[in-house]
Each structure stands twice: as structure tokens, then as C-alpha cells.
């Protein structure tokens, strides 16, 4: 896949001119090399004071790290010098140049197996593997909700083109090692696992290698189990209502549930003068329940038209799923039509017919 960036292998003490602002230059140096990065002023104009930054932290000059306004030198480079380097205007922090530097174990030129020296600063990708998108490689821990698809990526290059293999907890990882298998996509340098489960937790390592060397990256996968719960009803709904005789009323109930919820609207009634049965369960009549053509949205609203005094009382929204039930209740007060309504029940609303 085209990643839209330039990559170079750089020989010892080669000075690299800075890329245009906004581009990231990918550079590879050998262990022990002198890294030299050059950032000329844009358009050749005055530069002003600058600061060199590595992985977001300002570089402190030392015997090994030589910092100038347009140039950075890191002598005797090692693995730890790999990272994202940028030259910024000190006052505005505007990035003038941006480099991605990787320092390989092998020196960048010299005794390779076929006796040919690597070309110095030729722009040709030769030698040991390196990450082509190092800015994507620093997220080591992935916490993923169960049942989602996970993709680990290790975009790399090298010459000859490296191979990629995957380990789980330090051992070779193959499709037969998990239910549902895995998808290995060598062109995309990726491992895909669909519908992850808790047993997929662990350390996943990509190993990228060719005859010149090997690089690896380890990701830790944590699978988050969604704790199943009964439906959650929005606080304050349904709300108490006060209505005039003959008007229309709506009760609302907002239901949140991972598992498919079943919603019912109930009205509390009296049987032989009692509101509850012998076991303490309230007497209710079902006003609205799921039907073949009823949507969840429709069930979240109970509409009462042309209310009478008999409609006054307690109403309950009952929502259940495979885990359990939740319910919220509200009261309807019906007032005679001739009364002027000055103040409603403080918890409710007034609907004038």
C-alpha cells in the first residue's frame, strides 16, 4: 500500500536535508553512525531561534548531541536514538522539519553477506527491515470490548522485502490456535482477529526479518467483557402529569439495554378495594406491549387521549431483558375542566385541552 512518505537508508555521517514542512521523512541509520539532520529555513528566509525535539521532548545538548539552529548531530547512534525528531520555531512551536529516525543494530554500510556495500544516501531501500509508520507503533496496550474485531499492524520495509510472522505469548501463532481463526495479510503487515473473546488476551509480537536483520514489536491485548445488566431507565421519566379533563397526555420512558428489551406500560388498579394482592404484588392492567408492528420508539411513549377521571392514578413503565427487569412510575392527576389552572403539580406539566 502507498503510504505517501519517502524512505531513505542513510550511510555514516550523511547529512540529510529537511523535508518540506508537514512531510515526515523516514530515515535509517546504522548503530555507531553519526545522525545528522539538516533543517534549512523555509524559502531561504531568516529562521529565528529554533529548538530540536525528540518524541515530544526538547533535546539537551551534550558531548554526543550537538544542537545548532539548522542542524542536529547525534554521534555514535544507538537504538535509543530512534524516534520522531522535529525542528521547531522556538516562539511559535511551529514544526519546520520532521524526521522519523530508526537506528538498526547493523552498521548502515560495510560487510554485508553478498559483499556489496549499501549505497549511501541513494534513496534506495536496501538492508535491514525498518518500520515505515513508526508513529503508529507506540500504542502497546489495546483494550477492546468483547465481540469486536482487532487488527495489529506492523508496516515495514527493507530490501529484500522482509517476511512477517506472529507470536502469541512468545510462541508461534497460527489460525488453528483460536476459535474463528485469524487473518494474516502480509501485504498489509497485519493480523486480524474477528469477534475477540477473553481467551484472546495476551502479548502479540510481530517479527519482521530479512537476511540483514530482524525487528519486532509486541502489543498487549486486553479483552473487556461487557457486564450484562438489566435495562436502565432514564431518571425522571416518566414524569408526573396534571391534566384537564378531556385533554391529551403523554408519558415518556427512555430505555437503555444491550440485550433486546421488552417494554410494557401498566396502570395500577384496585381489586376489591385493594391495590396489592395477597403476596404484595400490585394489581395492574397492561395498557401497551410489544406487537408485530410496534417499534421500540413507539413503546417508549404512552398516549392517553381525552382523559377522564378514571384515567387518574399511577402508571408504570416496565422494561425487561434476559438479565432482569426495571421499572419507573408516575402519577396522573385529572382536574375538572372549569377550574382555572394556576399552578401544576411541581413535578409535572399541564396540558390544557
Amino acid at each position: 500500500e502507498s503510504l505517501g512518505t519517502e524512505q531513505r537508508v542513510v550511510g555514516r555521517a550523511a547529512e540529510v536535508p529537511g523535508p518540506e514542512p508537514g512531510q515526515q521523512e523516514q530515515l535509517v541509520f546504522g548503530s555507531g553512525d553519526a545522525v545528522e539532520l539538516s533543517c534549512p529555513p523555509p524559502g531561504g528566509g531568516p529562521m529565528g531561534p529554533t529548538v530540536w525535539v525528540k518524541d515530544g521532548t526538547g533535546l539537551v545538548p551534550s558531548e554526543r548531541v550537538l544542537v545548532g539552529p539548522q542542524r542536529l548531530q547525534v554521534l555514535n547512534a544507538s537504538h535509543e536514538d530512534s524516534g520522531a525528531y522535529s525542528c521547531r520555531q522556538r516562539l511559535t512551536q511551529r514544526v519546520l522539519c520532521h524526521f522519523s529516525v530508526r537506528v538498526t543494530d547493523a552498521p548502515s554500510s560495510g560487510d554485508d553477506e553478498d559483499g556489496e556495500d549499501e549505497a549511501e544516501d541513494t534513496g534506495v531501500d536496501t538492508g535491514a527491515p525498518y518500520w515505515t509508520r513508526p508513529e503508529r507503533m507506540d500504542k502497546k496496550l489495546l483494550a477492546v470490548p468483547a465481540a469486536n474485531t482487532v487488527r495489529f499492524r506492523c508496516p515495514a520495509a527493507g530490501n529484500p522485502t522482509p517476511s512477517i510472522s506472529w507470536l502469541k505469548n512468545g510462541r508461534e501463532f497460527r489460525g488453528e490456535h483460536r476459535i474463528g481463526g485469524i487473518k494474516l495479510r502480509h501485504q498489509q503487515w497485519s493480523l486480524v482477529m474477528e469477534s475477540v473473546v477473553p481467551s484472546d488476551r495476551g502479548n502479540y509480537t510481530c517479527v519482521v526479518e530479512n537476511k540483514f536483520g530482524s525487528i519486532r514489536q509486541t502489543y498487549t491485548l486486553d479483552v473487556l467483557e461487557r457486564s450484562p445488566h438489566r435495562p436502565i431507565l432514564q431518571a425522571g421519566l416518566p414524569a408526573n402529569q396534571t391534566a384537564v379533563l378531556g385533554s391529551d397526555v403523554e408519558f415518556h420512558c427512555k430505555v437503555y439495554s444491550d440485550a433486546q428489551p421488552h417494554i410494557q406500560w401498566l396502570k395500577h388498579v384496585e381489586v376489591n378495594g385493594s391495590k396489592v394482592g395477597p403476596d404484595g404484588t400490585p394489581y395492574v392492567t397492561v395498557l401497551k406491549t410489544a406487537g408485530a408492528n410496534t417499534t421500540d420508539k413507539e413503546l417508549e411513549v404512552l398516549s392517553l387521549h381525552n382523559v377522564t377521571f378514571e384515567d387518574a392514578g399511577e402508571y408504570t413503565c416496565l422494561a425487561g431483558n434476559s438479565i432482569g427487569f426495571s421499572h419507573h412510575s408516575a402519577w396522573l392527576v385529572v382536574l375538572p375542566a372549569e377550574e382555572e389552572l394556576v399552578e401544576a403539580d411541581e413535578a409535572g406539566s399541564v396540558y390544557a385541552g
Partner: antibody
């Protein structure tokens, strides 16, 4: 709750630059790449590029590499996009969006910043 | 870059009905497609990712399917709040591309 709050509308002159912001809250800012997307009036969405807030690394759509510069301020959990040498073609709504770390889709979006380039 | 051809560009449907939108990729995108709902003045809202995985909190009226280069997205039991423009996004490689969008109207 994840939220991305973008800066207000901008009216700028041709040839000028503009810098818009995207303030992130409700999650660890440095753990997720931040993308920027352009929507010209009546047109579809166009990916501009992303920045890794942790290390400052960027990846640009080639069509925008000379137009946009992406930066972040980790301490204020804010991502920025600067557009330079503006023309009428840059008049659009620009969105920031968080990349979901485990698959690469964009799961949360800002409300957009409208940029109008006019003399 | 991978091109995403989305169709239709607009459609009109009745409340309670069902609509289907398709996206065709210029190459195999290995199911890495997401679907978004976009309303004026707001940012796009993720509905579905990895072809058919519903985002938490999104009603099951929304669904997606497909593989290879061909993908579809459906909304059943259409409701008034579904009026919006819908986009597909391929995120198979590190150069993200969107479909042209489908504007949904209610008859």
C-alpha cells in the same frame, strides 16, 4: 463521555493562514490518533491526515501535504490544524475525529469548524 | 488510493419502510468499512464498523453486510430522525477514503 470540541467559524482572506483547534476530553488524549477531515459545501468527506498526540508523528493525504500542518498540545489535550495559502477551494467545514486504536475506524467526531475564504 | 463508489446519491422512503445503500470499493477492503450518519451542524456519527458490527447504543434497525469490494447498509422501520446523509468509509489501508454520500429523505 468522549467529546471533541472544535473552535468557531473563521472568515479569512485569500493567501492568509488559519489555525483551528480541537479540544479533547473524556479519554486519554495521547492514546488515540487524531484525524482531520474536510467537507466542501455540498460535497463528500475528504481525509486530510492524522497526528499521533503522543509522539507528534503525522501521516498526510498527499493532496494536503502542502496545505495542512497538524500539531498538538499535550498539556491542554488539544489538536490543531493550520491551513496556509488559502484560496476559495479551501472554504469548507473541517472536522477532527478520533481513531479507534484497535481497528483504525474513526469513532468520535467534533462538530466541525467552518472556514470561509473571501476577499 | 482506494475509491469508494456509493449509491444512490439520494433516496426517498416512507416512515416504517426500509432503505438500502451500497458502496463498491475499487479493490478488496477486507471488510474494513464503516457507516456514518451525518446531520447538518453536527459531526458524523459512527453507526457500524467492520462491515456489520453495530456501535453501542445504535438501534438494531441499522445493519450492514458485504465482503471483498461490495458492501451494503440498511435501515428498517424508518423513523423521522433517520433523515440525514449517510457515508461509507474504508479504513483498510492507511489512506482513509469516503463514499460520496447518500441523502435520505422521508416521503
Amino acid at each position: 463521555e468522549v467529546q471533541l470540541q472544535q473552535s468557531g467559524p473563521e472568515l479569512v482572506k485569500p493567501g492568509a493562514s488559519v489555525k483551528m483547534s480541537c479540544k479533547a476530553s473524556g479519554y486519554t488524549f495521547t492514546d488515540y490518533n487524531m484525524h482531520w477531515v474536510k467537507q466542501s459545501h455540498g460535497k463528500s468527506l475528504q481525509w486530510i491526515g492524522y497526528i499521533n498526540p503522543n509522539n507528534g508523528g503525522t501521516n498526510y493525504n498527499q493532496n494536503f501535504k502542502d496545505k495542512a500542518t497538524l500539531t498538538v498540545n499535550k498539556s491542554s489535550t488539544t489538536a490543531y490544524m493550520e491551513l496556509r495559502s488559502l484560496t476559495s477551494e479551501d472554504s469548507a467545514v473541517y472536522y477532527c475525529a478520533r481513531e479507534r486504536d484497535y481497528d483504525g475506524s474513526m469513532d468520535f467526531w467534533g462538530q466541525g469548524t467552518s472556514v470561509t475564504v473571501s476577499s | 488510493d482506494i475509491q469508494m463508489t456509493q449509491s444512490p446519491s439520494s433516496l426517498s422512503a416512507s416512515l416504517g419502510g426500509k432503505v438500502t445503500i451500497t458502496c463498491k470499493a475499487s479493490q478488496d477492503i477486507n471488510k474494513f468499512i464503516a457507516w456514518y450518519q451525518h446531520k447538518p451542524g453536527k459531526g458524523p456519527r459512527l453507526l457500524i464498523h467492520y462491515t456489520s458490527t453495530l456501535q453501542p447504543g445504535i438501534p438494531s434497525r441499522f445493519s450492514g453486510s458485504g465482503s471483498g469490494r461490495d458492501y451494503s447498509f440498511s435501515i428498517s422501520n424508518l423513523e423521522p430522525e433517520d433523515i440525514a446523509t449517510y457515508y461509507c468509509l474504508q479504513y483498510d489501508n492507511l489512506l482513509w477514503t469516503f463514499g460520496g454520500g447518500t441523502k435520505l429523505e422521508i416521503k
